[in-house]
Amino acid sequence: SNNSFTNFKLATELPAWSKLQKIYESQGKTLSVKQEFQKDAKRFEKLNKTFTNYDGSKILFDYSKNLVNDEIIAALIELAKEANVTGLRDAMFKGEHINSTEDRAVYHVALRNRANKPMYVDGVNVAPEVDSVLKHMKEFSEQVRSGEWKGYTGKKITDVVNIGIGGSDLGPVMVTEALKHYAGVLDVHFVSNIDGTHIAETLKVVDPETTLFLIASKTFTTAETITNANTAKNWFLSKTGNDPSHIAKHFAALSTNETEVAKFGIDTKNMFGFESWVGGRYSVWSAIGLSVALYIGYDNFEAFLKGAEAVDNHFTQTPLEDNIPLLGGLLSVWYNNFFGAQTHLVAPFDQYLHRFPAYLQQLSMESNGKSVTRGNVFTDYSTGSILFGEPATNAQHSFFQLVHQGTKLIPSDFILAAQSHNPIENKLHQKMLASNFFAQAEALMVGKDEEQVKAEGATGGLVPHKVFSGNRPTTSILAQKITPATLGALIAYYEHVTFTEGAIWNINSFDQWGVELGKVLAKVIGKELDNSSTISTHDASTNGLINQFKEWM
């Protein structure tokens, strides 16, 4: 394993780690955010950062309700310096092979390089090549959206079905949902699960004459995707007189594997490529985002890329003290490793962002769910938070109870857009939504002590049940509006937060060996399900389950 990017094995070896341990013991664990606000009238001013996007729109990141003070922030920044986060960041942006276990560059940032500055991987300036694919996406999406691209009977395309899984599904699903306001010409559907129900239910609502299938698979060998793709192809052929020449107008591939695409029967002119330096969970910026471009239009897709590019510029050019994603990542490390927090809640106060937590779940947990460092040793500290979330205010009526009064510390990010795309009832809904956004963060911070509970009339044994400890940390993210540029910026923010965490933990955030073992065993078991014999080759539990399944199937 190539570990030329970091010169330490474990984060616990770094002097700033020990320093933070001492600070945590002496002041961190007893720090009261409420008191910090009383002590420092400029706390909000100091601890909120405003990001200005390429189009002039703004996003405010308020870190002031976190369990930090000036000394803690300074020590965290010292940790970032000692871990050489900026060195690893710069190596990533230079196209170096920072994915050491797979010996690959990590270059999703090159996909949103709309300034078209030279960006090199292995001596190749990939900027013109990225631009070439985007030009293809632009031309194709405009042809389909305008009706110039027609199905085999001459009808225009009305529905797009994206067949993919993981990174080839989650990103496009989340983005098309988040930017639904910008759609209108086409309907998009997403099929990911190998469960036949997913493809069957989708095929019920589309017409073969007017449907375009996008087969999204980096390798074009992903079992779930290719099985679903073959089912779609068989369905299409059965409805269209079994004429394979019709496939060209109704199937496109988003892949790196031209040979497999051709074997499947898709014209390679309808293949939209990307490179091995694009990880699945970072691929929505690539040809994998074609469903997004088709749905919201290419110009909006480009604005989405530019929003991310603006965060990339901020991340690479801003001093550490004001570097928004870096601070977000440092706070995560602070809670994870010093407070023992194991989770990270992301609650968007925005129905359009209802899939955002699921998307971030893959981004964060597949990236940082690792226990071996770049130095090839097991960590002696916690990594990878369990990220979860649901849109608020729904979340307030489910798991917020535990966030407010449970036994676990759950650092939380709340996200709100000041301007709604649907300001109905004279903005009544938006004002109610916003009031909850502000109130929840305030409530988690200030809590409610025994005195207040009693003053409100509670007595006896009921009193402790109504007490809120408060001092529960939140980061409030307030955007002006959820536009393509804003969404691009928010995703890139979390990408670089994830990067910062991984750099400090000294883990490779860009491989995913953990997904392999289950896949291998599933292949073995798949063969066993094809015959009627009783299975005894596994442990008693697995054997028992397989045999019961076979009996009931």
């Epitope: 190749v124 090549e129 070439s132 030009k135 293809h136 074997k263 390679t268 490529g273």
Partner: nanobody, 119 residues
């Protein structure tokens, strides 16, 4: 800096063979459809043969079918044109052409190599 460098041209007798090579640098070679074009004196440049990025499909101009074979070695960033049963009318400057995904949005030309078929 993108470069396509052809080699292998020369003088050959009718019925003879030549193997042209074109080595690319500064590109993600396996993503480029590669072609050979030729231009005879006083004539238009014409397409001779094309191969897709992974080599999964090839196409030939009618007059060279069965005589010429295009192939590629992506590990060496090189495309070849094996020319057999050469005829005087094959005399031309042969150019290597790289087209990103074969879509025409990003393409590069080599300098050309002279092939002369004469007795």
């Amino acid at each position: 800096q993108v470069q396509l460098v052809e080699s292998g041209g020369g003088l050959v007798q009718p019925g003879g063979s030549l193997r042209l090579s074109c080595t690319a640098s500064g590109v993600t070679f396996s993503r480029y459809a590669m072609s050979w074009y030729r231009q005879a004196p006083g004539k238009e440049r014409e397409l001779v043969a094309t191969i897709t990025g992974a080599g999964s499909s090839t196409n030939y101009e009618d007059s060279v079918k069965g005589r010429f074979t295009i192939s590629r070695d992506n590990a060496k960033n090189t495309v070849y044109l094996q020319m057999n049963s050469l005829k005087p009318e094959d005399t031309a400057v042969y150019y290597c052409y790289a087209d990103h995904y074969g879509l025409g949005y990003l393409d590069y030309w080599g300098q050309g190599t002279q092939v002369t078929v004469s007795s």
